[in-house]
Interface confidence: medium
């Protein structure tokens, strides 16, 4: 090879990490560039190095893994650090080579601090838990890898800054929380803290999450469409400009996709000549349930325009709708003094 | 491997290139430096060039040596104006110590060196 | 630029012995040291590094040791074939373009009687 193969900074793996805590990072090489495991590598005769570049600095250096107490090892491919300083914050590469071959990535790590009540600038995973559905559990998640199996930690539960103890409906299980039955009330953050030992000293790994309560999959409908609906018709004379709105009601859906689309003569608008914009809003319920409005707009509307047929469509997991909008052309007033003279029979 | 070439006797104030030939690797890999030693003396850094190809001279050295590759598998050494204190064995070492050699930390692979007369 | 100060100049030991070394740094350079072995007519070989990390193919008699700026090489059941003169090496400046070098010490021989 005459150059390494650089897949650059990775900023999809934007990997953060409390200050004073273990954490164990895995090159990312194996999990997204390239087509074979770290064994593979090994046994091929591949030496996995690893460097840094400091926060707020472009030169690259090593990683000393000669430190006090070794707070920072590599084992296999993952980077140990037995706990992280703030310091640590910065862009990370694992290097793979030997004589003929090098591939690379680097990613960053970010190193926060939090506070007494666990708020932190790290951004936080959300776990969804539907509401009044029975039973329903949440893990301390990212804690795999960091004890073996026969170290037995103690962990605590927090919501928010408060321990969860004797509370109605959430119990602390070990790893899991349960929910006995999932309330609105139940929104917030939840925290685990860890505890583990490991050469004499003590560790503490702390993870929060975010709980959001959302629609049951047992009250979940098919999409409902508002309008346009039959008890509205959009009347208009030529030149003016005809607004339809379609606003559609989605019951929250785990993982479904939402879509709103309107159609004109049964084509989609950009599939057609004429100057219409679509403008969409979209709004929330408590429980994620879901509004969609979508406009349709022509500025001046042509007599051809109001004869054709507009319809809006729907669809989600739980199935496709249509609703066709009724609009027409607006006859003119008669015009006055022609209406007398033919009334009053003049010649 | 390495394999350094170009020492011999010159006069002073005339410069000499010494060349650095690797095989079974590549320059655009690793990290490379030149050590010397003088006769009977240790070992002393001149200087080394990162795969990128950034340069890095010890204090005494800058101005008075160049180091540049010449290709992927060819590292120069050139004398500006050799004086008899030049007068060493001429180590041309290769970085494992970090990835892309911008910082030796250690040298693990060494060439046998070659001998510079200054007289 | 950091200096590197390497005692004792020579040591004398028995086969079965223990050899200690000892390398100063005029300033700290956390664990970025390593040591080498040079025998008469021969490249120097990397022993240690990273203070402390054995190099491939080297013996466990050797032990390297320190942090900062006190680092020290133990050669334990000294053996006739570990007659050499023995390097320290540092890194300093890392992460510096204008500071960044390498230094050596003065070496050490070691005699085996």
């Known amino acids: 090879s005459e150059r390494c193969d650089d897949w650059g900074l990775d900023t999809m793996r934007q990997i953060q990490v409390f200050e004073d805590e273990p954490a164990r990072i895995k090159c990312p090489l194996f999990e997204h560039f390239l087509k074979f495991n770290y064994s593979t590598a090994h046994s091929a005769g591949l030496t996995l190095i690893w460097y840094w570049t400091r926060q707020d600095r472009d030169l690259e250096e090593p990683i000393n893994f000669r430190l006090p107490e070794n707070r920072i090892s590599k084992e296999k491919d993952v980077l140990w650090f037995r706990p992280t300083l703030l310091n640590d914050t910065g862009n990370y590469t694992c290097m793979l080579r030997n004589t003929t071959y090098c591939s690379k990535v680097a990613f960053p790590l970010e190193v926060v601090q939090k506070d007494s009540c666990f708020n932190s600038p790290m951004k936080l995973p959300v776990h969804k838990l539907y509401i009044e559905y029975g039973i329903q559990r949440i893990t301390c998640p990212n804690v795999d890898g960091y004890f073996p199996s026969s170290v037995k930690p103690t962990i605590t539960w927090y919501m928010g800054c408060y321990k969860i103890q004797n509370f109605n409906n959430v119990i602390p299980e070990g790893m899991n929380l349960s929910f006995l039955i999932a309330l609105i009330s139940n929104n917030g953050n939840y925290t685990c803290v860890v505890t583990y030992p490991e050469n004499g000293r003590t560790f503490h790994l702390t993870r929060t999450l975010t709980v959001k309560v959302v629609g049951s999959p047992k009250n979940a409908v098919p999409p409902v469409i508002h309008s346009p609906n039959d008890h509205v018709v959009y009347e208009k004379e030529p030149g003016e400009e005809l607004l339809i709105p379609c606003t559609v009601y989605f019951s929250f859906l785990m993982d479904s996709r939402n879509e709103v689309w309107w159609t004109i003569d049964g084509k989609k608008p950009d599939d057609i000549t004429i100057d219409v914009t679509i403008n969409e809003s979209i709004s929330h319920s408590r429980t994620e349930d879901e509004t969609r409005t979508q406009i349709l707009s022509i500025k001046k509307v042509t007599s051809e325009d109001l004869k054709r047929s507009y319809v809006c469509h729907a669809r989600s997991a739980k199935g496709e709708v249509a609703k066709a909008a009724k609009v027409k052309q607006k006859v003119p007033a008669p015009r006055y003094t022609v209406e007398l003279a033919c009334g009053f029979g003049a010649t | 491997s390495l394999e350094e070439s170009g020492g011999r006797l010159v006069t002073p104030g005339t410069p000499l290139t010494l060349t650095c030939t690797v095989s079974?690797?590549?320059?655009?890999?690793?990290?490379m430096g030149w050590v010397r030693q003088a006769p009977g003396e240790g070992l002393e850094w001149i200087g080394s060039?990162?795969?990128?190809?950034?340069t890095y001279y010890a204090t005494w050295a800058k101005g008075r040596f160049t180091i540049s590759k010449t290709s992927s598998t060819t590292l120069d050494l050139k004398i500006t104006s050799p004086t008899t204190e030049d007068t060493a064995t001429y180590f041309c070492?290769?970085?494992?110590?970090?990835?892309?050699?911008?910082?030796?930390?250690?040298?693990?692979?060494w060439g046998q060196g070659t001998l510079v007369t200054v007289s | 630029d950091i200096v590197m100060t390497q005692t004792p100049a020579s040591v004398s030991e028995p086969v079965g012995g223990t050899v200690t070394i000892r390398c100063q740094a005029s300033?700290?350079?956390?664990?970025?040291l390593s040591w080498y072995q040079q025998k008469p007519g021969q490249p120097p070989k990397l022993l240690i590094y990273?203070?402390?990390a054995l190099a491939s193919g080297v013996s466990s008699r050797f032990i390297g040791s320190g942090y900062g700026t006190e680092f020290t090489l133990t050669i334990s059941g000294v053996q006739s074939e570990d007659a050499a003169t023995y390097y320290c090496?540092?890194?300093?400046?890392?992460?510096?373009?204008?500071?960044?070098?390498?230094?050596f010490g003065g070496g050490t021989e070691v005699v085996v009687k």
């Open positions: 300033q700290s350079i956390s664990s970025w």
């Open positions: 070492v290769r970085s494992d110590g970090y990835t892309n050699g911008d910082y030796d930390t250690y040298f693990n692979l």
């Open positions: 990273q203070a402390s």
């Open positions: 090496q540092c890194t300093y400046g890392i992460g510096s373009n204008s500071d960044y070098g390498v230094a």
């Open positions: 079974g690797f590549s320059l655009s890999i690793y990290g």
């Open positions: 060039i990162s795969s990128g190809g950034s």
